[in-house]
């Protein structure tokens, strides 16, 4: 058991151009607070996946009002550390998310409004008991400077807080086979009498006779890897003969979730859905009150004035979970049109539009012809994110800039001769044919196949095509 501690040193504009606007104003004074979320291992999970190692909220910082015309300075911070207690072994590698939240203190109906200013995330290796580690993370134009460490709670010691120490029974030295507890030289390492056969690499115990597993291992002796191979059986230890998995104990066998939590298997391990008032990887953390700020993402905490009375988190729209720690998948309603990609940013939905579409929901089919002139009297035709020109007679090409040879396609039938003309083409028909393209035969008796020849034209005259 132990505590992860986070100390925020500063939050303000990062170096370089494009300083952010102050988040507060004279009309809307505000104050900051921070949330930290920890997950074991070097996971790259989404921000809203469970904070399996734990989470904490800071106190609210001092009220800040922007000075008109002044650049955004480093903003006033809450006092104290953010502390995330962990009951199990410290995993050594962890992922963190640190969120900077703004609480607006204007005249909003229904109390203050919360909004996420910045979120930074990272993956680190850290041994418990080591010195403070310093870090700088940037989120857009903001910069966050902080330090962190993991420390064991007595009687636990060691880089994973799995060794136990007890006060010396004799003043001079420890018992046979027991080392002094660095850095507590006046204490001795307690003999860990775990369940017989408990894996020394993957198991540990805090009470005599138990065998508790590190993440990724399961079974009564912590010898069964949680991950599975590509065989048909969903879980279990490898079979030496086939290399495949044979049925064995699953991660939810025996229900590792404490305090009435329900267990569900995940591809890599298990997840506990905790009853209200409990959280942590195994629902083991309790005694939480509203003063501890257990509701994330702007959730409103009611009740829970003392550790014996349960609190309730009233989640803002879009969040769920007993601590408002999970985001509802609003993108499943597919609000983006025309094949746009939906992104749920928490404070808003965003659509990434396909080429040729724009607007908050990709609802606008871009006017492909805007600013696209078709030359020489051509007209622009739009569609499908592209444009094309319908050219006037005698012109061609993408923008109707090329002069077309109207005779190139040999439009005059029955041996008629084609002449290019400023307004198109003219066919001089061979004897016995007439029409704009010489398409009509003239009958031997002088009558044509047409009802009547146009006035002023004799069969055989050149026909101009308009």
């Amino acid at each position: 058991a132990g505590v992860f501690e986070l100390q925020i040193h500063s939050f303000g504009p990062g170096p370089g151009p494009g300083a952010p606007r102050s988040p507060c104003s004279a009309r809307l004074p505000c104050r900051l607070f921070f949330r930290v979320c920890l997950k074991p291992g070097l996971s790259e999970e989404a921000a809203e996946s469970p904070c399996a190692l734990g989470a904490a909220l800071s106190a609210r910082g001092p009220v800040y009002t922007e000075q008109p015309g002044a650049p955004a300075p480093d903003l006033p911070l809450p006092d104290g550390l953010l502390q995330v207690p962990f009951r199990d072994a410290w995993p050594g590698t962890f992922s963190f998310i640190i969120e900077t939240w703004r609480e607006e203190l204007g005249d909003q109906i229904g109390g203050p409004a919360w909004s996420l200013l910045a979120r930074v995330a990272g993956r680190r290796r850290l041994a418990a008991g080591g010195p403070w580690a310093r870090d700088i993370q940037r989120a857009g134009a903001w910069e966050l400077r902080f330090s962190y460490r993991a420390r064991c709670e007595p009687p636990a010691v060691g880089t994973a807080c799995t060794r136990l120490c007890r006060p010396r029974s004799a003043p001079s030295r420890c018992g046979p086979g027991l080392r002094p507890c660095a850095p507590l030289e006046d204490e001795c390492e307690a003999p860990l009498v775990c369940r017989a056969g408990c894996s020394p690499e993957h198991g540990f115990c805090e009470q005599p006779g138990e065998c508790r597993c590190l993440e990724g291992w399961t079974g009564p002796l912590c010898t069964v890897p949680v991950s599975t191979s590509s065989c048909l059986s969903p879980r279990g230890p490898s079979s030496a003969t086939t290399g495949c998995l044979v049925p064995g104990p699953g991660p939810c066998d025996g229900n590792p979730c404490a305090n009435g939590g329900s267990c569900s298997e995940t591809p890599r391990s298990f997840e506990c859905t905790c009853p209200r008032g409990f959280y942590g990887l195994r629902c083991e953390v309790s005694g939480v009150t509203c003063a501890d700020g257990p509701c994330f993402n702007g959730g409103l905490c009611v009740g829970g004035a003392d550790p014996d009375s349960a609190y309730i988190c009233h989640c803002p729209p879009g969040f769920q979970g007993s601590n408002c720690e999970k985001r509802v998948d609003r993108c499943s309603l597919q609000p983006c049109r025309n094949g746009g990609l939906c992104l749920d940013l928490g404070h808003a939905l965003r659509c990434r539009c396909r080429a040729g579409f724009a607007g908050p929901r990709c609802e606008h089919d871009l006017d492909d012809c805007a600013g696209r002139a078709c030359a020489n009297g051509g007209t622009c035709v739009e569609g499908g994110g592209a444009h094309r020109c319908s050219c006037a007679l005698g012109f061609g090409g993408r923008d109707c800039r090329e002069r077309a040879d109207p005779c190139a396609a040999r439009p005059c039938a029955h041996g008629g001769r084609c002449y290019a003309h400023f307004s198109g083409l003219v066919c001089a028909c061979a004897p016995g044919y007439m029409g704009a393209r010489c398409e009509f035969p003239v009958h031997p008796d002088g009558a044509s196949a047409l009802p009547a020849a146009p006035p002023g034209l004799r069969p055989g005259d050149p026909q101009r095509y308009l």
């Epitope: 729209p317 609003r330 309603l333 609000p335 049109r337 025309n338 939905l349 929901r361 990709c362």
Partner: nanobody
């Protein structure tokens, strides 16, 4: 401000039917997408059925063939006709809408929820 008001929830026996209604009101210029989510105790909130931004109809696999979503554009209302109800359909059903406001901004809104209980 936009309000989504659900109605029609209640208790029904397995195999029975219910019809939920959700009416949107307020400073709405247009409704882009609208549908129904549900949340069973201890479970994540999940989409049940909806009209997408493109106007298509989508359903969760578990309700296909049993639930039908419809709408009345003139009344800014969507309906969920639920038939052949099962015990696992027990949940709080929430109306959700992605709305374009008079300001031309888009906002996503939730209703307060209506409880559907299926038990013998």
């Amino acid at each position: 401000e936009v309000q989504l008001v659900e109605s029609g929830g209640g208790e029904v026996q397995p195999g029975g039917s219910l019809r939920l209604s959700c009416a949107a009101s307020g400073s709405i210029l247009s409704i882009n997408a609208m549908g129904w989510y549900r949340q069973a105790p201890g479970k994540q909130r999940e989409l049940v059925a909806g009209f997408t931004g493109d106007g298509n109809t989508i359903y969760a696999e578990s309700v296909k063939g049993r639930f039908t979503i419809s709408r009345d554009n003139a009344k800014n209302t969507v309906y969920l006709q639920m038939s052949s109800l099962r015990a696992e359909d027990t949940a709080v059903y929430y109306c959700a809408a992605d709305v374009q406001l008079f300001s031309r901004d888009y906002e996503f809104y939730w209703g307060q929820g209506t409880l559907v209980t299926v038990k013998p």
